[in-house]
Interface confidence: medium
């Protein structure tokens, strides 16, 4: 979708120009997760709403099977927030007995999968120890940064424990990317 | 402000081009909040600095009466950080007595108001339980994502408790949006 | 690198157009920090990887000596995440004894240095009290916003305690900026 600017000889054009409105973009929102088998030692991937409510994909950015598909090489801003909620963690009970312990934790990873590369690449990670004493708890992890992506790359969001993800509202847990 | 590119027949142009420098943009910074009556069951909205220091609005993006006014339809990246600070929460005292309790919490919501739609739309929410034991506490909640907005839409930032917002520094609590 | 569009008289062009691909951009990733002398009452600056792995600088955006150098005036989105990790804080031990105390804290600041201004400007601050009871802890602070920057400005990331920064993975601690 990038057209070479053919311009009069007096016009300096340094690179192909393109309208902002035709750039690949997506904002995906949380849905209730169906429990799935995931590989041991590999965080499960979330699946997403891509059409209803605030969610959309446009300009050849497609969503399929937990992945955002990158349709065009370039620099993208990629972001996600996952809101977690849980009951008192075991760690806090151990703490109350005065025994220090490796804390429970919550983690979000935005991962890139490239067909030509055997291993997924972790682009962004937000990880937080959770040691709450005597109550329900809830909190978000937000991530966002710019990456050079290639046509055909696939992006997904992985979490440490899918059962802790708050799927109740589209504004609490989301995932997006846009070509700069 | 978008002009159709009339171009020679050999030039492919896919959409109107526009200069990046003329896109609507705003970065607003915190000011001391004046206590106001707000509707029961509705979080109060923050008001903001829009000219001094790091704050600015440009290219027809205007700020008025707690709202950022969207002057042109398109995809916008919208963000906010609110830093909260408070004293020991009641919940922590209850906890110390060993009685689990629904935790106190802090919440930020970026809300869209559309004249043609009776209900505000919550675009983004960051919500966190706060159960600090025996001290002052402080922490930020950050939000940011892309949304398709319409000319005339209004954006505001709502918080669960205006008295807990840290208004002391422009770099701690802020709100912004820009057309992509 | 901005060329005036010379166009037929029937074409409305409102400002110089420029290709998105030639805009200054950088994403820097964490490296192990070498202890350095820093001024009393001034948070130390982190240094960064700018070429390997996910890190890059392009289109005249240069990294040198802990600074990102802004090569062109304009509006930039600037972001950083710093993941901190530590052992039980002293404050939590004091808390356990039932004595309230000013909490330990972790802070990230994105700072602008301008040759025309003798004091650095704090653009963004994320600050959080840390009072963990009886364990190791870890957590990220994320920041991001838009600022009008001038050619020659320099950006850096300062932290309250360099020894608490998690430098183990490029996806946990990072710093970036791009011209909008």
């Amino acid at each position: 979708l990038k057209g070479q600017e053919f311009a009069p000889s007096h016009q300096q054009v340094y690179a192909p120009l393109r309208a902002d409105g035709d750039k690949p973009r997506a904002h995906l929102t949380v849905v209730r997760q169906t429990p799935t088998q995931h590989l041991k030692n590999q965080f499960p991937a979330l699946h997403w709403e891509h059409e209803l409510g605030l969610a959309f994909t446009k300009n050849r950015m497609n969503y399929t099977n937990k992945f955002l598909l990158i349709p065009e090489s370039g620099d993208y801003f990629v972001y996600s927030q996952v809101t977690f909620r849980g009951m008192t963690s075991e760690c806090s009970e151990i703490r109350q007995a005065g025994r220090p312990n490796k804390p429970d934790s919550i983690t979000v990873v935005i991962t890139k999968v490239t067909d030509s590369y055997p291993e997924p690449t972790q682009l962004l990670m937000g990880t937080k120890s959770v040691c709450e004493v005597g109550s329900n708890w809830f909190q978000p992890i937000y991530l966002g940064a710019m990456f050079s992506l290639q046509e055909g790359d696939k992006l997904m969001v992985n979490v440490s424990d899918i059962s802790l993800v708050d799927y109740t509202k589209e504004d609490k847990t989301f995932f997006g990317a846009f070509l700069l | 402000l978008k002009g159709q590119e009339f171009a020679p027949s050999h030039q492919q142009v896919y959409a109107p081009l526009r200069a990046d420098g003329d896109k609507p943009r705003a970065h607003l910074t915190v000011v001391r909040q004046t206590p106001t009556q707000h509707l029961k069951n509705q979080f109060p909205a923050l008001h903001w600095e829009h000219e001094l220091g790091l704050a600015f609005t440009k290219n027809r993006m205007n700020y008025t009466n707690k709202f950022l006014l969207i002057p042109e339809s398109g995809d916008y990246f919208v963000y906010s950080q609110v830093t909260f600070r408070g004293m020991t929460s009641e919940c922590s005292e209850i906890r110390q007595a060993g009685r689990p309790n629904k935790p106190d919490s802090i919440t930020v919501v970026i809300t869209k108001v559309t004249d043609s739609y009776p209900e505000p739309t919550q675009l983004l929410m960051g919500t966190k339980s706060v159960c600090e034991v025996g001290s002052n506490w402080f922490q930020p909640i950050y939000l940011g994502a892309m949304f398709s907005l319409q000319e005339g839409d209004k954006l505001m930032v709502n918080v669960s408790d205006i008295s807990l917002v840290d208004y002391t520094k422009e770099d701690k609590t802020f709100f912004g949006a820009f057309l992509l | 690198l901005k060329g005036q569009e010379f166009a037929p008289s029937h074409q409305q062009v409102y400002a110089p157009l420029r290709a998105d691909g030639d805009k200054p951009r950088a994403h820097l990733t964490v490296v192990r920090q070498t202890p350095t002398q820093h001024l009393k009452n001034q948070f130390p600056a982190l240094h960064w990887e700018h070429e390997l792995g996910l890190a890059f600088t392009k289109n005249r955006m240069n990294y040198t000596n802990k600074f990102l150098l802004i090569p062109e005036s304009g509006d930039y989105f600037v972001y950083s995440q710093v993941t901190f990790r530590g052992m039980t804080s002293e404050c939590s031990e004091i808390r356990q004894a039932g004595r309230p105390n000013k909490p330990d804290s972790i802070t990230v600041v994105i700072t602008k240095v301008t040759d025309s201004y003798p004091e650095p400007t704090q653009l963004l601050m994320g600050t959080k009290s840390v009072c963990e009871v009886g364990s190791n802890w870890f957590q990220p602070i994320y920041l991001g916003a838009m600022f009008s920057l001038q050619e020659g400005d320099k950006l850096m990331v300062n932290v309250s305690d360099i020894s608490l920064v998690d430098y183990t993975k490029e996806d946990k601690t990072f710093f970036g900026a791009f011209l909008l």
Partner: antibody
Framework: QVQLQESGPGLVRPSQTLSLTCTVS????????MHWVRQRPGRGLEWMGR????????KYNPSLKSRVTITRDTSKNQVSLRLSSVTAADTAVYYC?????????WGQGSLVTVSS | DIQMTQSPSSLSASVGDRVTITCRAS?????MYWYQQKPGKAPKLLIY???NLASGVPSRFSGSGSGTDFTFTISSLQPEDIATYYC?????????FGQGTKVEIK
């Protein structure tokens, strides 16, 4: 302690090139900007230009741009000024100045006389 | 160039007097700087960002203003304040100074 010391010949012939060096100590030059400012006898202060030592980027006063060059050698902690094709009107005290993120600091100045 | 017009060019006042110097920029600037220069010495920064007192500068010195009109004040003139004072803008290229105000004691 922060110090800036200008050095160079006190006398330069007309049409020659004036060369001054500023040697800095007590701070990392890469964290700052380094300027040259001059003051002609009985006149006010005139900013000549600056360099960003970290990257080597320069900015010059347009009125002097065709004649002035500022360079840096970070390994020696030095910034240099060259002013070509000098005339008697370039007789002045030349100051090296640090700015940027720190209280600005001036050298004590170096008097350069242009005379045959 | 942004022209800086400083006034008066000189003034004479008694110890303890309030002294005010003004500086007008030919176009709006965000920040203004004020320097003190004693005979045979390098200039010393007193005020930055229009109103911020530089480190170690006595509180009798102050600055105010915005846009094109700025003011520098010595609230109570002291003998050691005899000097020439310059305003400066750092925004346009080139950076430009006012022509200076020479302050003397009556």
């Amino acid at each position: 302690q922060v110090q800036l010391q200008e050095s160079g010949p006190g006398l330069v012939r007309p049409s020659q090139t004036l060369s001054l060096t500023c040697t800095v100590s007590g701070f990392d030059m890469g964290d700052t900007y380094m300027h040259w400012v001059r003051q002609r006898p009985g006149r006010g202060l005139e900013w000549m230009g600056r360099i960003e030592p970290a990257a080597g980027h320069t900015k010059y006063n347009p009125s002097l741009k065709s004649r002035v060059t500022i360079t840096r050698d970070t390994s020696k902690n030095q910034v240099s000024l060259r002013l070509s094709s000098v005339t008697a009107a370039d007789t002045a005290v030349y100051y090296c100045v640090r700015s940027g993120g720190l209280p600005d600091v001036w050298g004590q100045g170096s008097l350069v006389t242009v005379s045959s | 160039d942004i022209q800086m017009t400083q006034s008066p060019s000189s003034l004479s006042a008694s110890v303890g007097d309030r002294v005010t110097i003004t500086c007008r920029a030919s176009q709006g600037v965000e920040y203004m700087y004020w320097y003190q220069q004693k005979p045979g010495k390098a200039p010393k920064l007193l005020i930055y960002g229009a109103s911020n007192l530089a480190s170690g500068v006595p509180s009798r010195f102050s600055g105010s203003g915005s846009g094109t009109d700025f003011t520098f004040t010595i609230s109570s003139l002291q003998p050691e304040d005899i000097a020439t004072y310059y305003c400066q803008q750092w925004e346009g290229n080139p950076r430009t100074f006012g022509q200076g105000t020479k302050v003397e004691i009556k």
